[in-house]
């Protein structure tokens, strides 16, 4: 802001001069500027205990410019407003107030919520999620072979995160138990997990069958053809051991 203070040079009436410095049109020793040149705004500037008139090219924060014929003045925004376009339209509220449609409010109206970052009343945003992605393959301990019962997972994305008062997001992951036609793992399918783990027998009381999940869409009942007797199991284990030493027990 370009400020100019008056200094009397030519007496016109007691304490009033038209021979002023800078932007003043009329001025006095005691009061500074009394009126301003065209397009400049009159404002009171506090200097210690005293207020003197100054002429500014733009108004300071907390004020807006009012224009009347040949009289421009900086006029105070409302008490709760930091910057304003005019007396009735605030553009930034003072601390503790929220801006809504040019007004400064203690609390936001129904259906809106306070954004404490922008200090504005904003629409409540509810969570939005995408459709579920397809179910993942049925796996157990990261493998898709060498077992009969495992789990499968599906996910969905959050499209819109909720605002403070918005509805929370529903789960974005779903897991369910699944059963597969038990098949032997091929050599290439055994992956790191299989090679790194030591072969171990199931602990006493450890179930080989997963408890069916009520959510599971597939039946967990075994078909008789899928059963193997103990002799066949033993036989297979010996054969597997001969093929590769790195096979781990199927749980």
């Amino acid at each position: 802001q370009n400020a100019s203070r008056g200094r009397r040079q030519r007496r016109m009436h007691p304490n009033v001069s038209q021979g002023c410095q800078g932007g003043c049109a009329t001025c006095s020793d005691y009061n500074g500027c009394l009126s301003c040149k065209p397009r400049l705004f009159f404002a009171l500037e506090r200097i210690g205990m005293k207020q003197i008139g100054v002429c500014l090219s733009s108004c300071p924060s907390g004020y807006y410019g009012t224009r009347y014929p040949d009289i421009n003045k900086c006029t105070k925004c409302k008490a709760d407003c930091d910057t304003c376009f005019n007396k009735n339209f605030c553009t930034k509220c003072k601390s503790g107030f929220y801006l809504h449609l040019g007004k400064c409010l203690d609390n936001c109206p129904e259906g809106l919520e306070a954004n404490n970052h922008t200090m504005e009343c904003v629409s409540i945003v509810h969570c939005e999620v995408s459709e579920w992605n397809p179910w993942s393959p049925c796996t157990k301990k990261g493998k898709t072979c060498g077992f009969k019962r495992g789990t499968e997972t599906r996910v969905r994305e959050i499209i819109q995160h909720p605002s403070a008062k918005g509805n929370l997001c529903p789960p974005t992951n779903e897991t369910r138990k699944c059963t597969v036609q038990r098949k032997k793992c091929q050599k290439g399918e055994r992956g790191k997990k299989g090679r790194e783990r030591k072969r171990k027998k199931p602990n006493k009381g450890e179930s080989k069958e997963a408890i069916p999940d009520s959510k599971s869409l597939e039946s967990s009942k075994e078909i008789p053809e899928q059963r193997e007797n103990k002799q066949q199991q033993k036989k297979r284990k010996v054969q597997d051991k001969q093929k590769s030493v790195s096979v781990s027990t199927v749980h």
């Epitope: 009033v16 049109a25 009061n31 009394l34």
Partner: antibody, heavy 119, light 107 residues
């Protein structure tokens, strides 16, 4: 010493136009702001409007459609015209000078002239 | 428009009394307030402008104070020539508006 003197007819008929002139001495109407204020008998003061040093005018919106403020710089005079008057416009009309926001408002006043609206 | 509510509308006081007249604006007028004295049949006379500045030649017993919406004119020791009607005027924005006036009468 700045002096302002109002002049004009003291009686105006309803629906006619009230015309007053303020003659200024000791100052030029090409500087500052020159105002009209009125006061109905026994009542308070009402601001009417001004004409500026450049000849631009402001009229109180409550009177805007009826009020005209003009000037004659050669005579150092400014005038008020108020059309379609009624009994409610009966008042003492004052002209007054002001320098700007930083100075005394209406530092100088005329003595006032009573205008009665009556048939 | 900004409304100016002046009180009291009248008061009775004796010479030597301290008299206080108040003016309340309908919104913050940022110190743009003047006080006038008017005697019967005369034009108003400006006493104070910008809330607390005395016009040259006005006795120092007159003083003004206030800020925001609330303003006060004080006559510290009432003199016989002070019996008159007093008006406040805001000039924060146009149209300017006056208070309704306070008549100070002899008790």
């Amino acid at each position: 010493e700045v002096q302002l003197v109002e002049s004009g007819p003291g009686l105006v008929k309803p629906s006619e136009t009230l015309s007053l002139t303020c003659t200024v001495s000791g100052d030029s109407i090409t500087s500052g702001y020159w105002n009209w204020i009125r006061q109905p008998p026994g009542k308070g003061l009402e601001y009417m409007g001004y004409i500026s040093y450049s000849g631009k005018t402001y009229q109180n919106p409550s009177l805007k459609s009826r009020i005209t403020i003009s000037r004659d710089t050669s005579k150092n005079q400014y005038s008020l015209k108020l059309s379609s008057v009624t009994a409610a416009d009966t008042a003492v009309y004052y002209c007054a000078r002001y320098y700007g926001y930083g100075g005394p408002w209406f530092a100088y006043w005329g003595q006032g002239t009573l205008v009665t609206v009556s048939s | 428009d900004i409304q100016m509510t002046q009180s009291p509308s009248s008061l009775s006081a004796s010479v030597g009394d301290r008299v206080t007249i108040t003016c309340k604006a309908s919104q913050d007028i940022d110190s743009y307030l003047s006080w006038f004295q008017q005697k019967p049949g005369k034009a108003p006379k400006t006493l104070i402008y910008l809330t607390n500045r005395l016009v040259d030649g006005v006795p120092s017993r007159f003083s003004g104070s206030g800020s925001g919406q609330d303003y006060t004119l004080t006559i510290s020791s009432l003199q016989p020539e002070d019996f008159a009607t007093y008006y406040c005027l805001h000039y924060d924005e146009f149209p300017l508006t006056f208070g309704q006036g306070t008549k100070v009468e002899i008790k």
